[in-house]
Interface confidence: medium
């Protein structure tokens, strides 16, 4: 099974024009890797024509060097591809993004974007720990609905291979500190918490260290409590319909509900000339309801075939769950057959649907 190289691009737009050297992205690739740099427009606005520059010289596109307005790819990288890369506005030469790229002789461990560098002492570049994808670590706040799974990762490298430990709110964090425990994967530089609850809120810090130094990253977790609610029906559905006698009609109803919803289609009827009962409740007949072999998807559509004038009237989609009920209604108007509508059609006043 032969697989391709990852096409996630790395890098980010500099926050300010002409970033200081300390603000440049420092990226390490292995020999033979595809160097991929991305420079989205600052603030998401239009970027205009750009040029990619390496060590002060404009890059010429080739089969190996693929240049785009916001992205640069250098395929089959070698040591000679190491250097200072920047993306500049063509007209002003303003530096939008700056990258320091180092291509090591040893092939990289692969998909650093996952942070799963093989933790091996290669004998190359002995030194302090560093983030393998620093540009991916800008986002520090994670807001998660309760009961979901959370994973924090601190993809790092160094030689000797660094160790990783985790703190919660500045204190050592261990499995016994939370119901359900935690899962630590040192090879993945990861901390996993399943089925999070409000008490899991806080600051989570990874500490990555070896004998040459230590780096740390803090993530903030906010757990959002789900407030139970009755089903939500999509606005505008079902929609009023005008149909020609003998045609087919479909009413649609889109239901959103955390708790399992029960969906019914009702048609409003008259009893002894009245549309409502003594208590004000409308008279209805149930056209469609959940059965043993009915899916929610099927219940969200009411199909009427070969409609007659008796089918005209008000239809309601009723959805309920353990919290309560919601309903939306729509009207069906049935018009005479096509040939009786010629004059009206020509006047543009009737649309047979």
């Amino acid at each position: 099974e032969s697989l391709g190289t990852e096409q996630r691009v790395v890098g980010r737009a500099a926050e300010v024009p002409g970033p200081e050297p300390g603000q440049q992205e420092q990226l390490v690739f292995g020999s033979g890797d595809a160097v991929e740099l991305s420079c989205p427009p600052p603030g998401g606005g239009p970027m205009g024509p750009t040029v990619w520059v390496k060590d002060g010289t404009g890059l010429v596109p080739s089969e190996r060097v693929l240049v785009g307005p916001q992205r640069l790819q250098v395929l089959n990288a070698s040591h000679e591809d190491s250097g200072a890369y920047s993306c500049r506005q063509r007209l002003t030469q303003r530096v939008l993004c700056h990258f320091s790229v180092r291509v090591t002789d040893a092939p990289s461990s692969g998909d650093d974007e996952d942070g799963e560098d093989e933790a091996e002492d290669t004998g190359v570049d002995t030194g302090a720990p560093y983030w393998t994808r620093p540009e991916r670590m800008d986002k520090k706040l994670l807001a998660v609905p309760a009961a979901n799974t959370v994973r924090f990762r601190c993809p790092a490298a160094g030689n000797p291979t660094p160790s990783i430990s985790w703190l919660k709110n500045g204190r050592e964090f261990r499995g016994e500190h939370r119901i359900g425990g935690i899962k630590l994967r040192h090879q993945q530089w990861s901390l996993v918490m399943e089925s999070v609850v409000p008490s899991d809120r806080g600051n989570y810090t990874c500490v990555v260290e070896n004998k040459f130094g230590s780096i740390r990253q803090t993530y903030t977790l906010d757990v959002l409590e789900r407030s139970p609610h009755r089903p939500i029906l999509q606005a505008g559905l079902p929609a009023n319909q005008t149909a020609v006698l003998g045609s087919d009609v479909e009413f649609h109803c889109k239901v959103y509900s955390d708790a399992q919803p029960h969906i019914q289609w009702l048609k409003h009827v008259e009893v002894n000339g009245s549309k409502v009962g003594p208590d004000g409740t409308p008279y209805v007949t149930v056209l469609k309801t959940a059965g043993a072999n009915t899916t929610d998807k099927e219940l969200e559509v009411l199909s009427l075939h070969n409609v007659t004038f008796e089918d005209a009237g008000e239809y309601t989609c009723l959805a309920g769950n353990s919290i309560g009920f919601s309903h939306h209604s729509a009207w069906l108007v049935v018009l005479p057959a096509e040939e009786e509508l010629v004059e009206a059609d020509e006047a543009g006043s009737v649309y047979a649907g």
Epitope: E1, S2, L3, G4, T5, E6, Q7, R8, V9, S109, G110, D111, D112, E113, D114, G115, E116, D117, E118, R133, R136, M137, K139, K140, L142, V144, N148, T149, V150, R151, F152, R153, P155, K183, Q187, Q188, V192, Y219, D296, K297
Partner: antibody, heavy 127, light 110 residues
């Protein structure tokens, strides 16, 4: 009900093209990593391609790179696979699949497995 | 040749315990989550185990997953006739930047 429904398969000559679609329903499509996986007749599963929710990251197997293009339209809840320069060895049932939602930082591939699969669509490449 | 290596076949009698192995390397099983899939004849695959040893809701606890180093295994206890299927291990491969499957193991319930 969470569902994936593939379409677009059929018989095509070598060198020809096909576009597969996968219509998603019952979940917030725009939040999920989606994949295409294929299975040649009588053979095992082979991952073909994957795409992040924000369309910022795409992966391909070497066997299809340069010939297949994965894309998604979050407004239509649809995943696509454009297949060009088709070969006999591309003959397979093509499945689309979604990954479960894992919240993580840094945002990245979760590898939590494909928890929902479509029923598959058969692509036959033959002259 | 698959990146992950599984035995092509396995068998057992009803009630028995059967284990299916999956061997990989440091760039896949060694550093990423292992998933197991069950494919019943004529149907789409179904996720059986995720994150090495977790079962999605609806999967019986007769199925269990484990991992050690660069190898993983799927154990099925109390074997039933309906367990007869193809089983695939899978994982993300960091050096290939792709999702890799094992060749599959055909389980026969005798």
């Amino acid at each position: 009900e969470v569902q994936l429904l593939e379409s677009g398969g059929g018989l095509v000559q070598p060198g020809g093209s096909l576009r597969l679609s996968c219509a998603a329903s019952g979940f917030t499509f725009s939040s999920y990593y989606m994949s295409w996986v294929r299975q040649a007749p009588g053979k095992g599963l082979e991952w073909v391609s994957g795409i992040y929710p924000d369309d910022g990251s795409i992966y391909y197997a070497d066997s299809v790179k340069g010939r297949f293009t994965i894309s998604r339209d979050n407004s239509k809840n649809t995943l696509y696979l454009q297949m060009n320069s088709l070969r006999a060895e591309d003959t397979a049932v093509y499945y689309c699949a979604k990954d479960p939602l894992i919240y993580e930082l840094p945002i990245g591939y979760s590898s939590y497995g494909m928890d929902v699969w479509g029923q598959g669509t058969l692509v036959t490449v033959s002259s | 040749q698959s990146v992950l290596t599984q035995p092509p076949s396995a068998s057992g009698t009803p009630g028995q315990r059967v284990t299916i192995s999956c061997s990989g390397s440091s760039s896949n099983i060694g550093s990423n989550d292992v998933n197991w899939y069950q494919q019943l004849p004529g149907t789409a695959p179904k996720l059986l185990i995720y994150y090495d040893s977790n079962r999605p809701s609806g999967v019986p606890d007769r199925f269990s997953g484990s991992k050690s180093g660069t190898s993983a295994s799927l154990a099925i206890s109390g074997l039933r006739s309906e367990d007869e299927a193809d089983y695939y291990c899978a994982a993300w491969d960091s050096s290939l930047s792709g999702y890799v499957f094992g060749g599959g193991t055909k389980l026969t319930v005798l």
